[in-house]
Structure formats: C-alpha cells, structure tokens
Interface confidence: medium
Amino acid sequence: ELCDDDPPEIPHATFKAMAYKEGTMLNCECKRGFRRIKSGSLYMLCTGNSSHSSWDNQCQCTSSATRNTTKQVTPQPEEQKERKTTEMQSPMQPVDQASLPGHCREPPPWENEATERIYHFVVGQMVYYQCVQGYRALHRGPAESVCKMTHGKTRWTQPQLICTGEMETSQFPGEEKPQASPEGRPESETSCLVTTTDFQIQTEMAATMETSIFTTEYQ
C-alpha cells in the first residue's frame, strides 16, 4: 500500500530513508537536457523475498539531442558531484546500512540522473530527519517519521525535531555556546511525490533504526 502523501516537512531539516521497504518505487528522472530512453523503465521497484531484496529495472538516460544512443548506466565519479540542489556541499556518503529483511539499500546513481530523487513510499516506511548545516537539533536522538495505516488511510507520524540556527541562540553568561549541527541539505517536495537528496547521515541513526526511542511517543 503506497503512502498517500509526503513525510512531514520540518523547518530547516531534511529527511532520508536508511533503507527502502519492498514496494517502494523510485522514478527514473533525468537531468535537464536528457530523457529516459524510449524502451526504458518509468521507475525502479524494490522487490525481493524473505532473504534478499533488490531494485528491479534500471534507469537509463540519453541526451535529448541524440535519438538512438543510450548512455551507460555506470556513473562516473565526476557526475556524482553534480548531484546537488543547493550551494551547500556535503559528502554523498550515507553510512553503511544494516541489511534489513524486506528492505532495499539506496539505489546507486545512474548516469545523468536528475538532481532530486522522487520516491513513492509504502506503509511501514521510516524516514530519518536531521537539521541542515548551520542549524542544531533541540531534541536528542533520531527523529523519524513512519508511514502508518490508520482506519484505512495512510498518515506519517510527526517527527520530534526542532532545528534552530546558532545565530538565534541567546548568549547569556553561564550559557553554553551550541555546537555545530551535522551537515545536511535542504530538499524540495511536491505534493504526493517525495523528493530527497543525498546527505551525510549520523552513524548513530543507523544504529538506532530498529530501536528508535520515539516510535511510541507523541504519535
């Protein structure tokens, strides 16, 4: 069952899935000047059995100018650097994900893919939030949102995260100066289509993915 809407937005924060539940779809989007090859897939699909999950289909982009030539799917290192949506740079190095049954890892990039990925999530999907660069979380621990089915309708739980800028902090004698927050990138979203960009995830998020302290609180 696909989730009806996007994970909630949080001011000055961005989200990322650590792993994708079977049934998740990822649109095959190409960057400006390129298009899907004519016989190419519209989307990649996370499928599998109890022991192994993987992405079905491959996304392939070709130059809009050339009709018949198809580009190789294998990404070149310099092309990975192009995948950004803001001036804020952060390494495209998600932490190693635990191999969860029934989940796919982040799909590798394909050549000339769009700067944003549009996912269609399924019920049970969990996404993790973190503050973008220059902002600090006021809550401790992983902030996540889960797509749940309630009374036949899907909804995302509200993540417990507040991101505040260091410049906003009132510095009185005896008050600590805040530490810098982890790096991240803002995202853009369109209704019913979830777009995410890669950003660096704190290692402890992966470690607590299955045993989150917030799953039962405030939902």
Epitope: P8, E9, I10, P11, R136, A137, L138, H139, R140, G141, Q158, P159, Q160, L161, I162, T164, E168, T169, S170, F172, E175, E176, P178, Q179, I213, F214, E217, Y218
Partner: antibody, heavy 116, light 107 residues
Framework: QVQLVESGGGVVQPGRSLRLSCAAS????????MAWVRQAPGKGLEWVAV????????YYRDSVKGRFTISRDNSKNTLYLQMNSLRAEDTAVYYC?????????WGQGTLVTVSS | DIQMTQSPSSLSASVGDRVTITCRAS??????LNWYQQKPGKAPRRLIY???SLQSGVPSRFSGSGSGTDYTLTISSLQPEDFATYYC?????????FGQGTKLEIK
C-alpha cells in the same frame, strides 16, 4: 500517558522574583526540548522560552530576555522558569509544553499575578 | 518577529454551520502552521499541524489549508463542543508566534 504539572505561581510585587516548576512524567524527559508559554488574562498565547534537551540551547522572547531564565534538571524530570524583575505585564497563566512540533502536550498552567 | 493576524476576531454561528477562520502571516511561513482550540480555563489543544495535517483524535470536520502567508481553518459542520477560541501559530522561525485568536460563539 504524558503528564506536565506546573507549580510555583502566585501573587508577587513588581520587581520581585518567582520560580516556576514543571514536573514531567510519562515520556523520556531528557530526550525532549521543553518550553514555557504564557497567556495574560483574557488575552492570547505567547511563547516565552524554549530549552533544548540538554539545556545547552535556550531561546527567549525579547520582552523577557535578561530577566527570565529557563533551565531543567533531567535527573528530576523537571523544567524551571526563574523570573526576576517581574512587571505587571508578566501577569499570566504560564504553561509548560513539550512535543513542540506536535505541540499537544501541555500542563494545566499556573497563574502568576504581578501586582503592588 | 512574524506577525500572525486572524480574522474575524469573533463570530457567531449555529450548530451545523460551516465556519471558516483565516490567518495571515506578515511573511511567508512555508506552511509551518498549527491551529489550536482553547476552551475557558483549559490548556490549548492542537487540531492541525503543517497547515493541513489533522492531529490524531481530532474529528474530520476540522480541516486546514493555505500556503505562503494565507491560511484557513474550516469546520464543516459545527458541533456544540466546537464553541471555543481558535488560534493559529507559526513555527517557521523563532520566536514562534500565535494569532490573536478567534472566539467562536453560539448564535
């Protein structure tokens, strides 16, 4: 079941001090930001101060900066608001709240009256 | 600070009526808007977050919409328990600010 219980309100003269407390239970207090919100009699709501889970970040509305101090004791699951140099315009019901994005866990409030 | 202006300040309506309350922000708040209901002597209760997401346990007759600077709370069919004061609140940037409130009374 989340519970927030404020105490420490009362009648105080202008220029004097008062300390409010908020005892929290039913959730992992040390993981969550907390805040104080106030409401003057017959008036609207306003955020007073917010504190991060570990107390390292504090935010105040301009009208209370330098007079009010928000703090917390995670070992006691308690939030505090130290109010100094009180003014008549500080008269209000003071609520403590958590789950700030969700914004739906509030105490019952404690009334502070500043009057000579 | 971002100013939040609600209209009307008060309104009278009857059970079964459809009611709309509007909230205007002094600058773009990116849909980071909550709606609260408050009854006399009680703490506020959040109805809607993120402009249009219904708080768990809140009846579906409440709905929210809007973007940019203009937002709306709609009650599709007023029930006796809905007569209260309603506040909008932005959480786009600190200090978070509330509207001045809209008092909904029985006609």
């Amino acid at each position: 079941q989340v519970q927030l219980v404020e105490s420490g309100g009362g009648v105080v003269q202008p220029g004097r001090s008062l300390r409010l407390s908020c005892a929290a239970s039913g959730f992992t207090f040390s993981n969550h930001a907390m805040a104080w919100v106030r409401q003057a009699p017959g008036k609207g709501l306003e955020w007073v101060a917010v504190i991060s889970y570990d107390g390292s970040n504090k935010y105040y509305r301009d009208s209370v900066k330098g007079r009010f101090t928000i703090s917390r004791d995670n070992s006691k699951n308690t939030l505090y608001l130290q109010m100094n140099s009180l003014r008549a315009e500080d008269t209000a019901v003071y609520y403590c709240t958590t789950g700030l994005n969700s914004g739906y866990d509030w105490g019952q409030g404690t009334l502070v009256t500043v009057s000579s | 600070d971002i100013q939040m202006t609600q209209s009307p300040s008060s309104l009278s309506a009857s059970v079964g009526d459809r009611v709309t309350i509007t909230c205007r922000a002094s600058q773009n708040i990116n849909s980071f808007l909550n709606w609260y209901q408050q009854k006399p002597g009680k703490a506020p209760r959040r109805l809607i977050y993120g402009t249009s997401s219904l708080q768990s346990g809140v009846p579906s007759r409440f709905s929210g919409s809007g973007s940019g600077t203009d937002y709306t709370l709609t009650i599709s069919s007023l029930q006796p328990e809905d007569f209260a004061t309603y506040y909008c609140q932005q959480y786009n940037s600190w200090p978070w600010t509330f509207g001045q409130g809209t008092k909904l009374e029985i006609k």
